[in-house]
Each structure stands twice: as C-alpha cells, then as structure tokens.
Interface confidence: medium
C-alpha cells in the first residue's frame, strides 16, 4: 500500500491485536482503524492506546458497547486501576457493518471521528507521549490500522477531515441497498442498486456471503485472469467499484476496463515498463487521446498489494489508489447505465472485487 511518509499500516491484523506505534504518539498523529463489527459474537470491542503490551497502563480506552441501547465508554487505566468512565450515549457503530474510526492526537486531547463524523473528544489524563502501543480486542474484524503524521507531508496528501491513507480493502461484507446522498448529485435520482462483492476463499472459514449472487469459489486465493463481471445497473453518479490485488513481481502492465458493449468507456492501464498510468477510451476499436498526468509518483509497485477505488460522478470518474485520490477522468461515453461490464487483465493477482 502506498502510505507515504508514515509508519507502515497493519493490514488485516488478527484480533485481539497489539502493535507498536513507532515513535509513540505525537501531536498531530492520526491513526485510522478500519474494520467491521462482527454481527454474531460479543457485545463490545475496544481500541486502546497504551504503554507496553500488558494493558495495565492505557492512556485512552475507546470502548463501544452494544448494550442498554448502545453507548461508548472512554476511560484511562493507570497501574491497573480504571478511572471514572466518560460515557457517550450514542452508538455510531452497527453490528455487521464496516466502520472507519480515526483518532487525532492533539496536545490537550484525542479527537475521534467515526465514519467521517466527529464523535467525541477525550482530554488527556496522562501524558500521551508515554503511549507506544495500540491494541484492539472484542467483537470486531480489522481491515487495517494506518498512521499519518502531518509533519511528513506527502506530495498529494490524502485528506485530514476524514481518516486518510486508507487502502479501501474493506472486508467483503454485504452492504445491501444504498441511495445517492442528497444535495450532491444532479436532480435525476440514481437507481437503488445492490452491491455485488465477488469473493474468493482466502483462508478456511473466511468466506462471506454477498447480497446479490452466491460467492464465487476458486481453489486458490485469486481470481481467474482475465476477470470479467457484470456491473449490475451500470454506472450512475455515486456508484463505486473497488478492486484490490497484488502486482506480480515481474509485471509489465495490467488494465482495468469499464466497458459498454464493444466500447471501452474507461481503460485504466498502469504500465511499469513506462512508469505511467495511462487512461483512455476506445470507441469502435479506435482509441482516443491518452491521459497520463499524475499528481504524485506512480502508485503501483511491482510485487506490492494495491487497491483501486473508482467512483462515478455526474461528469467524471474519480479514481483513488490505496485510499488517496489519484485523478479524475471526464466521461467520454456519457450513457452511464450502458457501462455495465468490468474487465481486469494483465500482470496482477486480484484478491477482492466489489461492484
């Protein structure tokens, strides 16, 4: 994953999890915990910022509880003793649903954002610079824990109002139906569409169901290449497509195509032999003009995992790689609902596709 200028993320860590925060907590450090609340077992989970691995000294204990209508407990533990609880009688998490939890360390407090919305602030009871470990336990599955210190500014910063540097490799959970957000899109309503998550068996017992089709089973943790699938309902403003995979060590090129009949409405073509990310449209077997400009260095690296997030807007596609916005591609084929086929090919191994 392309997490520039910060500690490398912990990817898909097993729970319970404890990991070192390199350099400890610093003013301005943002830590993102991305995962899914388990729907079956347990009624609690916790994220702890602590000293060492014992759990006796926890500067900040963030503890959502699905009990008594749901609430979140914040507390501090010193020498094994808990202080007075601070309770927030609001539950921003839902069982079985993914979440993105972002902590901002500041001189006076921790600020906590859940799913892009500021949720709570917790004033320091002990000096935060003592913290060198983050731990997560309880009924939660983790996708990643990432770190970003704004003092090391990447060329193209991801964002600061929401959790950033996220690889967007969500656990493949059913999302159900969704609608466009109000106020943002043009007046014509987007269709209500089912998300389809194409899954593979990555480990015993880790198969998830999808709301629209049964899981696609393969004998090894990879998709067949080239991979072709239908985008139910085609594209429309607010439609998003997520792909994750790994670039082969000797990769030359790969492509992600969004197709409309015989046309390729959007051709995304990372080329390692040219150190470029080429975008184009093919209509009646004729290619248009290439777009190659990037706001930062080539985000795809041979031998490394990646995620690509394509968001359809009214005028363009927005593409993020490893959670950071990379470019916009203005629609050349404007009949969005007819763009209903995804094709992936080339020198990569796919691990997750969500259309």
């Amino acid at each position: 994953m392309a997490f520039s200028g910060s500690q490398a993320p912990y990817l898909s860590p097993a729970v319970p999890f404890s990991g070192t925060i390199q350099g400890g907590l610093q003013d301005g450090l943002q830590i993102t915990v991305n995962g899914t609340v388990l729907s079956s077992s347990g009624t609690r989970f916790a994220v702890n910022f602590q000293t060492g691995f014992s759990g006796n000294d926890i500067a900040f204990h963030f503890n959502p509880r699905f009990e008594d209508g749901g609430y979140v407990v914040c507390n501090t533990r010193q020498n094994g003793s808990w202080g007075p609880e601070e309770r927030k009688t609001h539950m921003p998490f839902q069982k079985g649903m993914p979440f993105d939890l972002c902590f901002l360390v500041q001189s006076s407090d921790f600020k906590v954002m859940v799913n892009g919305i500021l949720f709570v602030q917790y004033f320091h009871r002990v000096p935060f610079h003592r913290v060198d470990t983050i731990s997560v336990n309880g009924s939660v599955q983790l996708s990643y824990i990432s770190f970003q210190n704004p003092r090391t500014v990447p060329v193209q910063p991801a964002f600061s109002t929401v959790p950033f540097s996220q690889p967007v490799c969500f656990p493949p959970r059913p999302r159900g139906r969704r609608q466009k957000p109000p106020g943002v899109w043009p007046a014509n309503p987007a269709p209500i569409t089912q998300t389809v998550i194409h899954t593979v068996q990555s480990a015993p017992g880790q198969m998830f169901s999808t709301p629209a089709i049964p899981p696609m089973m393969y004998p090894h943790p990879a998709y067949p290449m080239p991979f072709i699938t239908t985008i139910l309902g085609g594209l429309y403003p607010s439609k998003s497509i997520l792909l994750s995979g790994t670039v082969l060590p000797s990769a030359q090129r790969f492509h992600i195509n969004l197709c409309s009949g015989n046309h390729i409405a959007f051709h995304l073509n990372p080329r390692f032999d040219e150190n470029a990310v080429v975008r184009n449209t093919q209509i009646d077997n004729s290619w248009g003009s290439e777009e190659r400009s990037l706001p930062r260095k080539m985000p795809f690296v041979r031998g490394q995992s990646f995620s690509v997030w394509i968001l359809c807007e009214a005028h363009c596609l927005k593409v993020a790689v490893d959670g950071q916005h990379l470019f916009e591609y203005y629609h050349r084929l404007r009949n969005l609902p007819t763009i209903n086929r995804l094709e992936v090919g080339g020198d990569i191994q796919l691990t997750h596709v969500q259309t």
Epitope: K88, H90, P92, P98, F99, D100, L104, K111, M113, V114, N115, G116, I117, L118, F119, V120, Q121, P150, V153, P154, P157, A158, F159, S160, T161, V162, P163, F164, Q166, V168, F170, R175, R178, P181, P182, G183, V184, T195, S238, S240, L242, W309, L311, K318, A320, G323, Q324, H325, E328
Partner: antibody, heavy 129, light 107 residues
C-alpha cells in the same frame, strides 16, 4: 425544499447576550451538520461554530470559544447560537448553514466534503453602546 | 489552525475572459475544499465541493482543481452574472477556515 431561517438578531450592548435561532425545514437537523458563519460589514466570511448533530460534537472558532454555544433541538428541528459576553467585533450578519450531506463510508477517499450547500438569509447582530 | 491564503484579492475582467483564483493552504489539507460565490446582500452559493466536484445546478464553466496545497477555481468564460466575490473554504477536524475572498469586477 431545504430552508434555513435565522432569527434573534438585533442591537445589544457590549457584554450582553443574544440567542440566535435557525429553523430548518426540508431536512432534519438530527442527521445533518449545522454551521454558523458570520460576515462583518464589508468583510469576508468567518466561520463561528459547528454542531455535528448525529453525534452532538461541537466545535468553535478561537475568537468565540468560551463565549458562544451552539446547540440543536431536534424536536423543533432548530439550531441555536447562544452568544454571551458580546463584543463590538462580533457585529456581523450571522448565517446559519447546512453541511453538504456526506457520502456513506464507501466513498471516503472523497467522502467528507466540509462544504455548505444551503444558507439562511442571515440575521444582523449589532454590538454597540 | 490551517489558513487559506486567497489570491488575488480583486481582479478586473471582461465578459468571455478566463478567470483563475487560487487558494493556498498553510499545511497539508484534504480535498475537503469548497468554493463559493457571493453577491452583495446575499448569502454565499456553493459552486465547487471536494476541491473539484461541480455542485448540482452550477454552470460547467466553473471548475476546481488542486495541486498539493494549492486549490484553484477557474471560470472558463466569464459571464455578466459571474461578477461577484468568491471564497474558498477548507474543513479539517471540525475546524473551518475561509479565504479572504476575491472580488471579480467588470473591466
């Protein structure tokens, strides 16, 4: 149709208090973020305070911190700005405004807009002796 | 706090001109940058959100872009109704800051 209507402005002496109201229609304040933005005569826009109603989180500009309080009454679908210890430099037109709706979680690389799509007509607050 | 330095503070242009207004953030910010148009005695109107997304109903002659900490509003062909004051705005962890404004006047 989304509408925001401010009220409660007027003339007040330095050190005095005022409570501004913002009646919302066409959406629910309980699921939106509400901002107060002010504009002194002939000057630019200045953010004052915000309430993230879904969580109750509030934030304030340094210039008003400790003097102003933002709140919302979901039963009345109304947001408020309680202004205490008013100063001459607080004289301005005060706008109540709604944040653009967030994308849900699945669009976060672009997800939190922090932009204001609907504004009230404004209410003038004059602090003068 | 993050400051947004907007330039120029004013400019004179003619109908049909291409106009560019820039805001520079004092530190790394997200793409949660918006642009507004305000006319005298009126509330501001949202033009661009998320740095480059055109808000519903806004003419396509308005566009936004970013390069690092620089954010740009471009009016490709100035129309009579575009003479107004323009503001950029960023949002970071619940704190909002506006640029000082750019007044676009008729040449």
């Amino acid at each position: 149709e989304v509408q925001l209507v401010e009220s409660g402005g007027g003339l007040v002496q330095p050190g005095g208090s005022l409570r501004l109201s913002c009646a919302a229609s066409g959406f629910t304040v309980s699921s939106s973020s509400i901002h107060w933005v002010r504009q002194a005569p002939g000057k630019g826009l200045e953010w004052v305070a915000s309430i993230y109603s879904s969580s109750g989180y509030t934030s304030y500009a340094d210039s008003v911190k400790g003097r102003f309080t933002i709140s919302a009454d979901t039963s009345k679908n109304t947001a408020y700005l309680q202004m205490n210890s008013l100063r001459a430099e607080d004289t301005a037109v005060y706008y109540c405004a709604r944040n653009v709706e967030n994308y849900p979680y699945w669009a976060w690389p672009w997800g939190y807009y922090g932009a204001i799509d609907y504004w009230g007509q404004g209410t003038l607050v004059t602090v003068s002796s | 706090d993050i400051q947004m330095t907007q330039s120029p503070s004013s400019l004179s242009a003619s109908v049909g001109d291409r106009v560019t207004i820039t805001c520079r953030a004092s530190q790394s910010v997200s793409s949660a940058v918006a642009w507004y148009q305000q006319k005298p005695g009126k509330a501001p109107k949202l033009l661009i959100y998320s740095a480059s997304s055109l808000y519903s109903g806004v003419p396509s002659r308005f566009s936004g872009s970013r390069s690092g900490t620089d954010f740009t509003l471009t009016i490709s062909s100035l129309q009579p109704e575009d003479f107004a004051t323009y503001y950029c705005q960023q949002s970071s962890w619940g704190l909002i800051t506006f640029g000082q404004g750019t007044k676009v006047e008729i040449k």
